[in-house]
Interface confidence: low
């Protein structure tokens, strides 16, 4: 996630307009206090996504923290978020207004807590006072959060001076609670459903016998209430569950489902939330792509993996040269598709001890009634190079002609070399490379053919030696990314009575 201009905080002039851009490789959105402010989102030409937050005619009320987050349809894998804080110094506004429930601060044990009185101007000096006493307390102040410290059960007030007037905040009430721990877990049968399917969410509490469940969910906003079912699961430890069931989901049922559990005897509570996304139609989308050409090595095993996201569960087919593939009884080919998270899948094609005939065009297709994707690539099988023959001929013009033929995939390179001192060759003396020499002592010609049926290259290299005046050891070496192979022949002058 990249925010432009970069933060982490901005101090804006009142009534000004300010534009913030957040970009990422996945869809993003801006949030402010869990609300989604008006913004424009777009996919850029380079495939990245941007969301633009335009703050127009700003006032002190725009002071606060803003988050750029991944669009929550992408699920928990992309939970990263970036925070910036904006101040709009506003002389007409003292402390930022608070919801009445935020004025009551409940502290469990002796833990650090925050009295969240905040001002619009980071330059203002703010002090904290016990309401009954007018002496400032020595507690650190964070302009973005408030006073942070350990507070007694008392009543507190914040003060600042704007211009020549003293401004007081609302009164904050701190209460200490003695509580026993409460363990709440929330889970959904599915966190992604299509409209018309059902949503079922369970909220389970362990080890507490008397609890109250309170649900908040998207339907509440429109006043349509869902009656949860409470389920007592006796045992050790005892478990009490509340089940929220919506038999026919609508698009508006997307959002956060929160289960708030309070223990009746001491008002201690805990809450857990889960996000559910209702989609109009199912989807299938690739999460990774493969290179156009994939390489396998002859007689080695090769696994090709495609990662995609889908709902509902798709069918997956693999094709080779437009023919459907299936697991082979001989175990030469293994297909598997596994569900690695609720909507994420990995489909694998494993070729065991790859054969040349397995080179070709492969396609994976994932599909269901609503959508489909496919991914294609060419599989190239690399074959070690072999020198198949090194032959010698003697035309009447006195030349010596050497012909070297070999095969391999990818295309082999040919190197000719010679060694004159037969006794020390080739271990004690480095061979001399041969080629089209300017002195016209040798002439080299190489032809390459690709054999479609064998899916490999054949190289035929012809070396013409104009005159040989003493015995030579000549080596033809073929080399490709899979290795090298060579053969040697000893060439003698025409006048000598022997040939090796």
């Amino acid at each position: 996630l990249v925010i432009t201009p970069p933060g982490p905080e901005f101090v804006l002039n009142i009534s000004s307009t300010f534009v913030l851009t957040c970009s990422s490789s996945a869809p993003v959105m801006w949030e402010q206090m869990s609300q989604v402010p008006w913004q424009e989102a777009a996919m850029n030409q380079d495939g990245t996504f941007s969301s633009v937050l335009t703050l127009t005619n700003v006032t002190g009320g725009d002071t606060g923290e803003y988050f750029c987050v991944y669009n929550n349809s992408l699920g928990p894998e992309l939970s990263e978020r970036k925070r910036i804080y904006i101040f709009v110094p506003d002389p007409t506004m003292g402390f930022l207004p608070m919801d009445s429930e935020d004025l009551f601060i409940f502290v469990t044990d002796v833990t650090e807590t925050t009295i969240p009185c905040r001002v619009t101007d980071p330059q203002l000096e703010v002090t904290l006072h016990e309401k009954k006493v007018d002496i400032p307390l020595h507690v650190p102040y964070d302009h973005q959060r408030g006073f942070i410290g350990t507070f007694e059960d008392k009543t507190y007030i914040c003060k600042t001076t704007i211009g020549d007037r003293e401004v007081d905040s609302d009164t904050y009430y701190v209460y200490s609670l003695q509580v026993s721990s409460i363990n709440v877990s929330v889970n959904a049968v599915q966190t992604v459903v299509r409209q018309g399917e059902s949503i079922t969410i369970r909220c389970i509490v362990m080890g507490n016998d008397v609890v109250n469940f309170q649900w908040t969910y998207p339907r509440m906003k429109s006043g349509r209430l869902v009656e949860p079912v409470t389920d007592y699961l006796f045992g050790v430890p005892s478990r009490i569950g509340s089940i929220l069931h919506i038999p026919t989901a609508e698009l508006s049922d997307s959002g956060t489902y929160t289960c708030n559990v309070s223990v009746s005897v001491n008002d201690h509570g805990d809450e857990k939330a889960i996000n559910v996304t209702v989609i109009e139609n199912g989807y299938v989308r690739l999460l990774e792509t493969l290179e156009d050409v994939q390489i396998a090595e002859l007689h080695r095993s090769r696994t090709l993996q495609v990662v995609f996201e889908a709902y509902p569960t798709p069918s997956v087919l693999w094709f080779k040269d437009n023919r459907t593939l299936g697991d082979s009884s001989a175990g030469e080919l293994v297909l598997s598709t596994r569900n690695v998270s609720e909507t994420r899948y990995v489909s694998e094609l494993t070729l065991v001890r790859v054969k040349v005939s397995e080179a070709g065009y492969y396609t994976m297709r994932a599909f269901h009634a609503d959508d489909q994707v496919q991914l294609s690539f060419k599989l190239q099988v690399n074959v070690p190079v072999r020198v198949l023959e090194l032959s010698e001929s003697h035309p009447a013009n006195g030349e010596q002609i050497l012909r070297c033929r070999g095969r391999g995939m990818p295309q082999p390179n040919v190197t000719w070399s010679t060694c004159r001192d037969l006794k020390r060759c080739p271990r004690k003396l480095s061979p001399t490379p041969l080629g089209n020499s300017s002195k016209e002592e040798s002439q080299l010609e190489t032809n390459v053919t690709f054999w479609e049926e064998d899916q490999e290259y054949e190289v035929v290299s012809t070396l013409r030696l104009r005159h040989v005046d003493q015995p030579l050891s000549v080596r033809c070496m073929l080399q490709n990314s899979m290795g090298r192979d060579s053969q040697e022949v000893t060439v003698v002058p025409h006048s000598l009575p022997f040939k090796v």
């Epitope: 869809p27 495939g47 299938v284 989308r285 690739l286 156009d292 297709r365 959508d371 489909q372 496919q374």
Partner: nanobody, 122 residues
């Protein structure tokens, strides 16, 4: 880089037919879907039809039965045959290419043509 060129637009009477062509060049291996969108003056761009590389087709409800999308793989061309045209079909028609997913939304398409004007008079 994928490039798209539309042709075949023009002025016709209500009830007539028209065939639009979209020639795709420089296709990358993961550009699977070619779609048609349209935009009338003062209105948002809307999805019309799309075709997957493997032949699956998708249509906007209001054009089903009247419009047919097809492709000629050899010519790398996608066609939109529009029959029984209505005045409300008047718009600039854009060809777009993308890699799939939500094929009925323009966020799925990364490459767009310049557009061809279709005007249906009553």
């Amino acid at each position: 880089e994928v490039q798209l060129v539309e042709s075949g637009g023009g002025l016709v009477q209500a009830g007539d037919s028209l065939r639009l062509s979209c020639t795709v060049s420089g296709r990358t291996f993961n550009t699977y879907v070619t779609g048609w969108f349209r935009q009338a003056p003062g209105k948002e761009r809307e999805f019309v039809a799309a075709i997957h590389q493997i032949g699956s087709t998708y249509y906007r409800n209001s054009v089903k039965g009247r419009f047919t999308i097809s492709r000629d793989g050899a010519k790398d061309t996608v066609y939109l045959q529009m029959n029984n045209l209505k005045p409300e079909d008047s718009a600039v028609y854009y060809c777009a290419a993308g890699n799939g997913g939500y094929v009925m939304s323009d966020i799925a398409y990364g490459t767009w043509g310049q557009g061809t004007q279709v005007t249906v008079s009553s």
